[in-house]
């Protein structure tokens, strides 16, 4: 059920999850000069029942100067294909995303945590993209990618986000949108060119979902 690959890399864009499906693992990584405590957890695991999901295990880091032991904080080689590095994000999930049944919120930071988080995503996980600072997207609406299982293999849908130009950074879905400025900055820049591979046309009923130019006949 683990996704074999990382979410797609989009030029001038980053991604993050708004909530994490049960089964997702987060490596217990420590910043330089620190290591996991001896017998500490290798990872946190999103687990739960029908009514509540939470992260099992706690990550703990200690100064590596106190003991001369191996500082193994990354997955073993056979796990490497499952790892995905993202910049650490503060918990800012919109309620409707983070409260999804079977999903965990962004774990709070732990002391001396590494600056990047390495997640092992599972099938059904959705991530959202935004243009990095200095770039903006051609279309309005969220750009998302979903890990799907097809013919026994996992793959991520392609968001086709196009980030272009020297523009102000954008907001993720659920974050407060910047006010329109005299320069005419868009309401939302979390978007994509043609958007997801689902090729669904945006309707008012699905305005919060991924948008695209084509009708459902293109699914």
């Amino acid at each position: 059920e683990l996704c074999d690959d990382d979410p797609p890399e989009i030029p001038h864009a980053t991604f993050k999850a708004m909530a994490y499906k049960e089964g997702t693992m987060l490596n217990c990584e420590c910043k330089r000069g620190f290591r996991r405590i001896k017998s500490g957890s290798l990872y946190m695991l999103c687990t739960g029942n029908s009514s509540h999901s939470s992260w099992d295990n706690q990550c703990q880091c200690t100064s590596s100067a106190t003991r001369n032991t191996t500082k193994q904080v990354t997955p073993q080689p056979e796990e490497q294909k499952e790892r995905k590095t993202t910049e650490m994000q503060s918990p800012m999930q919109p309620v409707d995303q983070a409260s999804l049944p079977g999903h965990c919120r962004e774990p709070p930071p732990w002391e001396n945590e590494a600056t990047e988080r390495i997640y092992h995503f599972v099938v059904g996980q959705m991530v959202y993209y935004q243009c990095v600072q200095g770039y903006r997207a051609l279309h309005r609406g969220p750009a998302e990618s979903v890990c799907k299982m097809t013919h026994g293999k996992t793959r991520w849908t392609q968001p086709q986000l196009i980030c272009t130009g020297e523009m102000e950074t954008s907001q993720f879905p659920g974050e407060e949108k910047p006010q329109a400025s005299p320069e005419g900055r868009p309401e939302s820049e979390t978007s994509c060119l043609v958007t997801t591979t689902d090729f669904q046309i945006q309707t008012e009923m699905a305005a919060t979902m991924e948008t695209s130019i084509f009708t459902t006949e293109y699914q």
Epitope: L138, R185, S212, T215
Partner: antibody, heavy 114, light 111 residues
Framework: EVQLLESGGGLVQPGGSLRLSCAAS????????MHWVRQAPGKGLEWVSV????????YYADSVKGRFTISRDNSKNTLYLQMNSLRAEDTAVYYC???????WGQGTLVTVSS | QSVLTQPPSASGTPGQRVTISCTGS?????????VHWYQQLPGTAPKLLIY???ERPSGVPDRFSGSKSGTSASLAISGLRSEDEADYYC???????????FGGGTKLTVL
């Protein structure tokens, strides 16, 4: 059904001007960046210009920079291309396109000739 | 001269497999942008054939497939049919132009 319908093409003398329009329907026009792409007779496709969903930024191919202006009116679901200082080499079918572009109109012919 | 390079022509007999290449640069295909393919039948507007390197819109037969590697991409047509005779164009976003760039087109002839 997604539809893009171009109009405004025709015969114009070198140095003259034309304004092309593209009426869009069947999708949320205000959510998408739009393109103009042209095709000279017997030639390939050439991108002309793109405008963001809200019209706040625009880009042009070097061949038309300073002469063509792209704009849009989201309240009318319409895309425009103002073409000034037209040259013989601007003669082409002009397509309005949305997305990758993944949907195209049928095109309007612009002929620049004396 | 087109930013993306395609062979001007290709041909095959019915039932054969034909491949059309598309070569770009580090500012478009090589930068990680998706490649899209269009089919243009005589006298008609281009129609999206393959998007996101290898995805087919519904209605497009699975005889058409796409792939991408490095700064190049290719379109494969298997089980060639007479109705496949058309011009084929590849396209990708170009970060230096801030717009999509097209290949020069490949005229496919079914012998």
């Amino acid at each position: 059904e997604v539809q893009l319908l171009e109009s405004g093409g025709g015969l114009v003398q070198p140095g003259g001007s034309l304004r092309l329009s593209c009426a869009a329907s069947g999708f949320t026009f205000s959510s998408y960046g739009m393109h103009w792409v042209r095709q000279a007779p017997g030639k390939g496709l050439e991108w002309v210009s793109v405008i963001s969903y809200d019209g706040s930024y625009k880009y042009y191919a070097d061949s038309v920079k300073g002469r063509f202006t792209i704009s849009r009116d989201n309240s009318k679901n319409t895309l425009y291309l103002q073409m000034n200082s037209l040259r013989a080499e601007d003669t082409a079918v002009y397509y309005c396109a949305a997305g990758v572009p993944d949907y195209w109109g049928q095109g309007t012919l612009v002929t620049v000739s004396s | 001269q087109s930013v993306l390079t395609q062979p001007p022509s290709a041909s095959g007999t019915p039932g054969q497999r034909v491949t059309i290449s598309c070569t770009g640069s580090s500012s478009n295909i090589g930068a990680g942008y998706d490649v899209h393919w269009y089919q243009q039948l005589p006298g008609t507007a281009p129609k999206l054939l393959i998007y996101s390197n290898n995805e087919r819109p519904s209605g497009v037969p699975d005889r058409f497939s796409g792939s991408k590697s490095g700064t190049s991409a290719s379109l494969a047509i298997s089980g060639l049919r007479s109705e496949d005779e058309a011009d084929y164009y590849c396209a990708a976003w170009d970060m230096s132009l801030n717009g999509p760039v097209f290949g020069g087109g490949t005229k496919l002839t079914v012998l």
